[in-house]
Amino acid sequence: IFPLAFFIYVPMNEQIVIGRLDEDIILPSSFERGSEVVIHWKYQDSYKVHSYYKGSDHLESQDPRYANRTSLFYNEIQNGNASLFFRRVSLLDEGIYTCYVGTAIQVITNKVVLKVGVFLTPVMKYEKRNTNSFLICSVLSVYPRPIITWKMDNTPISENNMEETGSLDSFSINSPLNITGSNSSYECTIENSLLKQTWTGRWTMKDGLHKMQSEHVSLSCQPVNDYFSPNQDFKVTWSRMKSGTFSVLAYYLSSSQNTIINESRFSWNKELINQSDFSMNLMDLNLSDSGEYLCNISSDEYTLLTIHTVHVEPSQETASHN
């Protein structure tokens, strides 16, 4: 309902708003203040999203999908603010919203294009499948389809069999890379160009270490300083691979500065941790300690994996007893 009077028609302008799944957003709309304000928000020019006139909301004909999800900035309407507060956006909310505002002297039309993105924190995993070693970059829920970049020693490479499953809401993506026998460094970047958000996984293989039984081993884990910042929340996990699966030896949470140690022979140097050095010592080695040791430093923005191979050999004494 617009007042029947002489009014100026102001041509439409268009804005893009980018929202994140399940978060609240504001669809902006402003007008030159005036009396007898009427505001109608519509979706794709047909579904009624929100209506306001005669000083209050009139939501009788509001489309059910918007029930309890929209409101105006009521104290600011008289100042020319017709913006819509929109709760818990979903991917189904994407599209064009039109705001029609009428006052005693003019009618204005504002178009807002809503785009919705999803980006759940990805992960980088190291897996053994029979005799093959794989790095897998995966993201459980992402929208729109992300750009995935693999690099070997800082040069882009092709990964050949990305697994992608699409649902109504988003994509789930697994990108495996066979790294069997390689000692190169690898990097995987997953980029959501709509949300302007990226995540990077890095994998570095250290030279193999040969140790004698009952000696101790020192395994380094120092993040390179381009991505890593000690001011951000992160988690460090040391694990050992046994018969194809990793068991956690210890972990550290930066938020609480807590260290949890599951293996009594494992030690971490608190002073080194304070200097962002997560190298560890394993004392009194025995033959069953041979294997792969993985240091995983993870935050919302990256995963840094460092892998060491340790070979424990029988000491001379043990060998002569046999």
Partner: antibody, heavy 119, light 111 residues
């Protein structure tokens, strides 16, 4: 909205140094990288390098390694580029530009700082 | 360094028709999944503006009349139908390996 506001035009003598600034607003400064790009009058664009404000890590185009130095001040969301041992070849417009972490294209640019090197 | 060669150096296209700008790199800058080529538009007295990233992905807010394609060493920017406001210089840029370089630019004039 995202904005990169660069410092004003500079006039410098050969051999001198200048330091220009790029103040970011409308986004989380430490979540993106700042790249610097050179454009000589009537010519194309040259990538100088970038700084990661969160960690102060820098990467330079070899050509500019001894010419440019990047710094960043997180508290004021400002990135800086210092150019040393100036010659007439350094006369150009210098842009700062925002880049996503790990992605080497530039989605927002400053308006540019014009540097004139003249005796 | 990777050299990007743009052609033509300049072109004039009638309003409403198609403009095609080519960018050729001195070595391949794509994998089987991604082309590491990006396109920018620069108007006089203004900074460049991102149009397309990774060969074919339109930046949010850029009109759909802009499109990109290509792989390996050959990439193309298409503008159809051209509008008066598309008068500008267009640059390609690769992000394959350091240092990242730009093409020499193509100046587009609308007739």
């Amino acid at each position: 909205q995202v904005q990169l506001q660069q410092s004003g035009a500079e006039l410098a003598k050969p051999g001198a140094s200048v330091k220009m600034s790029c103040k970011a607003s409308g986004y989380t400064f430490t979540s993106f990288w700042i790249h610097w790009i050179k454009q000589r009058p009537g010519q194309g664009l040259e990538w100088i390098g970038y700084i990661i404000p969160n960690t102060d890590y820098t990467e330079y185009n070899q050509k500019f390694k001894d010419k440019a130095t990047f710094t960043a001040d997180k508290s004021s969301s400002t990135a800086y580029m210092q150019l040393s041992s100036l010659t007439s070849e350094d006369s150009a417009v210098f842009y700062c530009a925002r880049g996503l972490r790990g992605a080497y294209y530039f989605d927002y640019w400053g308006q540019g700082t014009t540097l004139t090197v003249s005796s | 360094d990777i050299v990007l060669t743009q052609s033509p150096a300049s072109l004039a296209v009638s309003l409403g028709l198609r403009a095609t700008i080519s960018c050729r790199s001195s070595q391949s800058v794509s994998t089987s999944t991604n082309g590491y080529m990006h396109w920018y538009q620069q108007k006089p007295g203004q900074p460049p503006k991102l149009l397309i990233m990774y060969a074919s992905n339109l930046e949010s807010g850029v009109p759909a009349r802009f499109s990109g394609s290509g792989s390996g060493t050959d990439f193309t920017l298409n503008i159809h139908p051209v509008d008066e406001e598309d008068t500008a210089t267009y640059y390609c840029q690769h992000s394959w390996v350091l240092p990242y370089t730009f093409g020499g630019g193509t100046k587009l004039e609308i007739k």
